[in-house]
């Protein structure tokens, strides 16, 4: 996991999230997203 400190003084944690593709309409097994500060962006 990567951790970044911003000038505002708070830390944003980047964390890979794994989902089952069949839950989101695909059939490719497990897929990975990226959570930045609690929001999945990819």
């Amino acid at each position: 996991d990567a951790e970044f400190r911003h000038d505002s003084g708070y830390e944003v944690h980047h964390q890979k999230l794994v989902f089952f593709a069949e839950d989101v309409g695909s059939n490719k097994g497990a897929i990975i997203g990226l959570m930045v500060g609690g929001v999945v962006i990819a």
Partner: nanobody, 123 residues
Framework: EVQLVESGGGLVQPGGSLRLSCAAS????????MGWFHQAPGKEREIVAA????????YYTVSVEGRFTISRDNAKNTVDLEMNSLKPEDTGIYYC????????????????WGQGTQVTVSS
């Protein structure tokens, strides 16, 4: 609500095998992705393996890939974890957990948890 009861833990020598089983009751088992988590002494709970609602998709953490196999039987409401080539670092409590569809499968944020079963790998 889903009730989960694990079994199959015990003491095994390095290189040995164990099969953990988790029996579910309550709500519709096939509505939930299922996961096995490992909690080593003094450490946080971490995902080991997960299986999708249908059983078609599986996920393994890198350290157990090729050694552990997760499977489920939706007719019997069970999910199993076959553990081979066990190592001392596999020691700890193993928890079965159920998670609603569409939620991240690698975080310990599952909705329902069993009480855990102890696995000790030691010579």
């Amino acid at each position: 609500e889903v009730q989960l009861v694990e079994s199959g833990g015990g003491l095994v020598q390095p290189g040995g095998s164990l099969r953990l089983s988790c029996a579910a009751s309550g709500r519709t088992f096939s509505d939930y992705n299922m996961g096995w988590f490992h909690q080593a002494p003094g450490k946080e709970r971490e995902i080991v393996a997960a299986i999708s609602r249908s059983g078609r998709s599986t996920y393994y953490t890198v350290s157990v890939e090729g050694r552990f196999t997760i499977s489920r039987d939706n007719a019997k409401n069970t999910v199993d974890l076959e553990m081979n080539s066990l190592k001392p670092e596999d020691t700890g409590i193993y928890y079965c957990a159920a998670n609603s569809a569409g939620r991240a499968i690698n975080l310990p944020l599952y909705k329902y948890w069993g009480q855990g079963t102890q696995v000790t790998v030691s010579s």
